[in-house]
Interface confidence: low
C-alpha cells in the first residue's frame, strides 16, 4: 500500500507538471480536485512551482465555487487549501485499496489516477 501511495504521489506531481500542456492531463486533475475538494499535491502552493503556470494562479477546479477563471488571481479564502495526495490517499486506503488491488498501470503515466467509477462513487456518496 505504501508503494502504491508513493507511486500515486509521484504521478500526481508529474501530472501537475503536464497540466498546462495537456488537456487530457488537466481534465484528470480537475476532476480529482473538484470531486475531492483539494488543491495541489501537498497543498495549493504546489501550483506555484509549476513553471508554465502563471503566477498567482491555480486551476479553476481548486475553487470552492468553480467558475471559469476563478483560479486566476485567486483569493485564498475562495479555494480549497488541502492537498490532494493526503486527502485522496486517505480515501483510497479506506474505500478502494481494502476492496480491490489497484495496479501500478492504473496509477501510472497517462492513465487515470483513480478510475472514474471510484471518483463517481465518492462524488455521489
Amino acid at each position: 500500500r505504501d508503494k502504491v501511495m508513493s507511486e500515486f504521489n509521484n504521478n500526481f506531481r508529474q501530472q501537475m507538471e503536464n497540466y498546462p500542456k495537456n488537456n487530457h492531463t488537466a481534465s484528470i486533475l480537475d476532476r480529482m480536485q473538484a470531486d475531492f475538494k483539494c488543491c495541489g499535491a501537498a497543498n495549493y502552493t504546489d501550483w506555484e512551482k509549476i513553471p508554465s503556470m502563471s503566477k498567482n494562479r491555480v486551476p479553476d477546479s481548486c475553487c470552492i465555487n468553480v467558475t471559469v477563471g476563478c483560479g486566476i488571481n485567486f483569493n485564498e479564502k475562495a479555494i480549497h487549501k488541502e492537498g490532494c495526495v493526503e486527502k485522496i490517499g486517505g480515501w483510497l486506503r479506506k474505500n478502494v485499496l481494502e476492496q480491490k488491488l489497484i495496479s501500478e498501470e492504473d496509477l501510472g503515466g497517462e492513465q487515470k489516477l483513480i478510475s472514474e467509477e471510484d471518483l463517481h462513487h465518492h462524488h455521489h456518496h
Epitope: 495537456n22 488537456n23 487530457h24 488537466a26 481534465s27 480537475d30 476532476r31 473538484a34 479553476d60 477546479s61 465555487n65 468553480v66 467558475t67 471559469v68 498501470e105 492504473d106 497517462e110 492513465q111 487515470k112 478510475s115 472514474e116 467509477e117 463517481h120 462524488h123 455521489h124
Partner: antibody, heavy 119, light 108 residues
Framework: QVQLVESGGGLVKPGGSLRLSCAAS????????MNWIRQAPGKGLEWITY????????YYADSVKGRFIISRDNTKNSVHLQMNSLRAEDTAVYYC????????????WGQGTTVTVSS | DIQMTQSPSSLSASVGDRVTITCRAS??????LNWYQQKPGKAPKLLIY???SLQSGVPSRFSGSGSGTDFTLTISSLQPEDFATYYC??????????FGQGTRLEIK
C-alpha cells in the same frame, strides 16, 4: 486532421445484433475517453456509453445497460459498440464522439452511422 | 441524474436578429455547460464550452453566459447559416452525460 469515422450500421431485426466501429485519426487516441451518442429520427441527442482511455472503466445509459458493450483497441485507434438484443427504439444515427473533459466540450464527432431495427 | 431544459423548443427569427436561447439545469452545474449546433443530416458541432468559452473557429457572434442553473446562448446577428437546432449539455456530473431537448431555430 482530427477525424472519427463510424461504420457497421445497417438494418437488423428485433432481437438481433450489430457491431459498430469507429476509426480515429489525427490525434493521440490513447489519451482520450470515447463516447457513443445516438439520435433517434426527429429526436434529440442521447448519450449511451463511454470508455476511459485505458479501456478499463465503462459506463452505460440505463436504456442500453446489459445489452450494449463498448470496447476499444488503442493499438488500432478504434472503438467498438457491440449491440445485442436490439429493439425498435434503438433505431437511430449513432455517433462516435471524443470524450468531453471537465472544461472542454465534445469537440470531435464522427459523421454518424444509421442503425435501423425493424422486422 | 441532472436534467437539462431548453427554452424555447423552437423559434422563428430573421437574418440580422439577435437571438437568445436558454438552458436550465435541475441542479447547480457551476460552469460545466456546453452548447452545440446541429444542421439537418450532420453531426453536432461544438460552439461554446465551459458556459462562455468560444470554441476555436466559431464566429464571435456566438456567445454564452451563465453559471449555476441558468445559462444562455446568444447569437448577436443571425446569419443564414445559423438556422439549425441548438443543444445544451452538462458535463458537471457524469455519467450520464445529459443534453437539453434542443431548440430549433427557423427562418421567419
Amino acid at each position: 486532421q482530427v477525424q472519427l469515422v463510424e461504420s457497421g450500421g445497417g438494418l437488423v431485426k428485433p432481437g438481433g445484433s450489430l457491431r459498430l466501429s469507429c476509426a480515429a485519426s489525427g490525434f493521440t487516441f490513447s489519451d482520450y475517453y470515447m463516447n457513443w451518442i445516438r439520435q433517434a429520427p426527429g429526436k434529440g441527442l442521447e448519450w449511451i456509453t463511454y470508455i476511459n482511455n485505458g479501456g478499463y472503466t465503462k459506463y452505460y445509459a440505463d436504456s442500453v445497460k446489459g445489452r450494449f458493450i463498448i470496447s476499444r483497441d488503442n493499438t488500432k485507434n478504434s472503438v467498438h459498440l457491440q449491440m445485442n438484443s436490439l429493439r425498435a427504439e434503438d433505431t437511430a444515427v449513432y455517433y462516435c464522439v471524443r470524450d468531453p473533459r471537465m472544461y472542454y466540450g465534445m469537440d470531435v464527432w464522427g459523421q454518424g452511422t444509421t442503425v435501423t431495427v425493424s422486422s | 441524474d441532472i436534467q437539462m431544459t431548453q427554452s424555447p423548443s423552437s423559434l422563428s427569427a430573421s437574418v440580422g436578429d439577435r437571438v437568445t436561447i436558454t438552458c436550465r439545469a435541475s441542479q447547480s452545474i457551476s460552469s460545466y455547460l456546453n452548447w452545440y449546433q446541429q444542421k439537418p443530416g450532420k453531426a453536432p458541432k461544438l460552439l461554446i464550452y465551459a458556459a462562455s468559452s468560444l470554441q476555436s473557429g466559431v464566429p464571435s457572434r456566438f456567445s454564452g453566459s451563465g453559471s449555476g442553473t441558468d445559462f444562455t446562448l446568444t447569437i448577436s446577428s443571425l446569419q443564414p447559416e445559423d438556422f439549425a437546432t441548438y443543444y445544451c449539455q452538462q458535463s458537471y456530473s457524469t455519467p450520464p452525460i445529459t443534453f437539453g431537448q434542443g431548440t430549433r431555430l427557423e427562418i421567419k
